[in-house]
């Protein structure tokens, strides 16, 4: 009896694992084995596919074959008993194009109100992704074990910290990788769960802000208790993208080591141009807090996000404010080529009650003022980029008197 060729061959590639699956064409014939050949582009001869010779099942693994993953390959299969079937040719394919990204490895660390997630590619030193190792981004789904309500977090890198969690609570998460350059989305990792610890005695510092004064950076934060010492550390932001790297070499800012106030001042030349992460920790001598949330700090934006300069034209019931580019030393205006929002605070000179206007325009009207009254105005600029949520310091206050009545035209 003539053996029929096997049919419906499927090639599954996950990371560096190459799996072939096929259907027997004749279930009634026993003791049949199957063998594959392969052919590279531009070659006439067929080569035996190692790992896929004389296979009794309908699945084989040819991961050991050292292929150029960017080169097209053709496969053929036949059934064998006493005689052999004709060859069945599989459509040619490029391994890289066909490959799926496997589940990443996930390693969790818990704090009282935060979880640190370390993510690395599922296949170490993968051949398939050798040129793309630094291009992986990850997304995750996290939920409280007790509620199951899912939150998705997109576009994270190999180390990510989730804040504002509840103490003594079990959280579960799963992670998948993506190679956006190749339009590839991976498969999810198994679910990993971890319980946050009991609440720490000392909370971490909050609301960290960086501003520029003269040639210095001023770093400020809020803290719940008095008589504490603080330390500040920095890290190059790009290091968080480094796959498989679990050691983050946070560096001390020398002028911000063991400071006793909720701010520290350090020279701008501490940092070269770049994007950094900053974090602050509190200590009372016996205990230390966990580290604060990490803030992103871009020297380019920070250095030039100076307080706006403005002129006031006074009317009887309003001020017209004209915002101009801030001046550098030497009185040259600073070119700011990113969109800004302006926050204008004004108050009656004799009162503490402040009012606020937020405007994107550079000419702003402050309405509903009383005639012949001294009002003071200060302003600051904010970047409109959510990721680099930066603010300048406030300008010095400028005080002006409104005109007498009936001069509003």
């Amino acid at each position: 009896k003539n053996l029929k060729s096997p049919q419906k061959v499927e090639v599954d590639i996950i990371d560096d694992n190459f799996i072939l699956r096929w259907n027997r064409s004749d279930e009634s014939v026993g003791n049949v084995t199957f063998s594959f050949d392969y052919q590279k582009t531009g070659m006439d001869n067929w080569i035996k596919l190692s790992g896929c010779q004389n296979i009794t099942s309908t699945k084989c693994n040819f991961s050991s074959l050292k292929l150029n993953v960017y080169e097209e390959i053709k496969l053929r299969i036949r059934a064998e008993k006493e005689n052999t079937s004709s060859w069945y040719e599989v459509d040619s394919f490029t391994p890289f194009r066909k490959a799926q990204i496997g589940p990443p490895e996930v390693h969790l660390e818990a704090e009282d109100k935060a979880i640190v997630i370390h993510i690395s590619p599922g296949t170490k030193d993968s051949v398939m992704w050798a040129l793309d190792g630094l291009s992986f981004t990850y997304s995750l789904v996290i939920w409280k074990n007790s509620s199951g309500v899912e939150e998705r977090i997109e576009n994270i890198y190999s180390r990510h910290k989730i804040y504002k969690l509840s103490p003594e609570t079990t959280y579960c998460l799963k992670v998948k990788a993506a190679l956006l350059t190749s339009w590839k989305i991976g498969v999810y990792s198994p679910v990993h769960c971890i319980k946050t610890t009991v609440e720490n005695e000392l909370p971490p510092p909050e609301n960290i802000e960086v501003s520029v004064q003269n040639q210095n950076y001023v770093l400020k934060w809020d803290y719940t208790y008095a008589n504490m010492t603080f330390q500040v550390q920095w890290l190059h932001a790009f290091l968080k993208r480094n796959p498989g790297n679990h050691l983050y070499k946070w560096k001390q800012i020398p002028d911000c080591e063991n400071v006793k106030t909720t701010q520290c001042v350090f020279p701008q030349n501490v940092f070269q141009k770049g994007i950094y992460l900053l974090r602050v920790q509190a200590s009372d001598g016996n205990n230390t807090s966990f580290w604060s949330e990490e803030i992103k700090f871009d020297t380019e934006i920070q250095a030039f996000l100076l307080p706006p300069v403005f002129n006031i034209r006074s009317l009887s019931d309003s001020f017209h404010i004209y915002i101009g580019a801030p001046k550098q030393s030497g009185n040259t205006p600073v070119i700011q080529d990113y969109p800004l929002i302006y926050e204008i605070i004004f108050w009656e000179n004799t009162s503490n009650a402040e009012r606020k206007i937020i405007e994107k325009k550079t000419d702003v009207t402050v309405p509903n003022l009383k005639p012949l009254t001294v009002y003071c105005v200060k302003a600051r600029a904010h970047t409109m980029d959510e990721k680099l949520n930066k603010s300048s310091v406030f300008s010095d206050a400028v005080c002006e008197k409104t005109k007498p009545g009936n001069t509003s035209k």
Epitope: A110, D112, I194, H246, L247, K249, F290
Partner: antibody, heavy 117, light 105 residues
Framework: EVQLQQSGADLVKPGASVKLSCTTS????????MHWVNQRTEQGLEWIGR????????KYAPKFQGKATITADTSSNTAYLQLSSLTSEDTAVYYC??????????WGQGTTLTVSS | DIVMTQSQKFMSTSVGDRVSVTCKAS??????VAWYQQKPGQSPKTLIY???YRYSGVPDRFTGSGSGTDFTLTISNVQSEDLAEYFC???????FGGGTKLEMK
């Protein structure tokens, strides 16, 4: 294969100084912290300090501040521990170890230092 | 400074037993704790990191647990080659516990 090869046993006199070495292979020390740990006879492990070989930044346990100096030579992938003003209390086995972020994953075989007149 | 305390200096066990070595941190350290095994005349070896993750090549009879201030290394089905000293470490401050020696009954 990752290896940390330490210098041989040393016998030195009280008051003297000594420099122990830890030559590594199979990785670039710039990518890790390198630590030194000592262990006195029948005692536990005691952390001395560490270096970031990439920029030479060091950190020491308070007890070893002024006693220990850690350096690194990235061209030879070697970390060093210098101990000064030695006393019999410094007699111990000294280990170098590599830090991958969550533990010391590779250790040298240890150098036995004996301080005796 | 963070202090890691291993209250039991010695523990007696028999082959096949289950034994738990404990370690207490002087303050909340999250899960940043590693466990090491040291046999006489040898360098320490990593068993557990991040409180509960088994280091590669470590037999699955070694299990780490705990968070905050209380941590445990459990060896189920103790083997004769497990007779050694065990150290915990808080790896952000690098502080080691005093060690617990596992002996045969």
């Amino acid at each position: 294969e990752v290896q940390l090869q330490q210098s041989g046993a040393d016998l030195v006199k009280p008051g003297a100084s000594v420099k122990l070495s830890c030559t590594t292979s199979g990785f670039n020390i710039k990518d890790y912290y390198m630590h030194w740990v000592n262990q006195r006879t029948e005692q536990g492990l005691e952390w001395i300090g560490r270096i970031d070989p990439e920029d030479g930044e060091t950190k020491y346990a308070p007890k070893f501040q002024g006693k220990a100096t850690i350096t690194a030579d990235t061209s030879s992938n070697t970390a060093y521990l210098q101990l000064s003003s030695l006393t019999s209390e410094d007699t111990a086995v000294y280990y170098c170890a590599r830090d991958w972020g969550h533990s010391f994953d590779y250790w040298g075989q240890g150098t036995t230092l004996t301080v005796s007149s | 400074d963070i202090v890691m305390t291993q209250s039991q200096k010695f523990m007696s066990t028999s082959v096949g037993d289950r034994v738990s070595v404990t370690c207490k941190a002087s303050q909340n350290v999250g899960t940043t704790v590693a466990w090491y095994q040291q046999k006489p005349g040898q360098s320490p070896k990593t068993l557990i990191y991040s409180a509960s993750y088994r280091y590669s090549g470590v037999p699955d009879r070694f299990t780490g647990s705990g968070s905050g201030t209380d941590f445990t290394l459990t060896i189920s089905n103790v083997q004769s080659e497990d007779l050694a000293e065990y150290f915990c470490q808080q790896y952000n401050s690098y502080t080691f516990g005093g060690g617990t020696k596992l002996e045969m009954k």
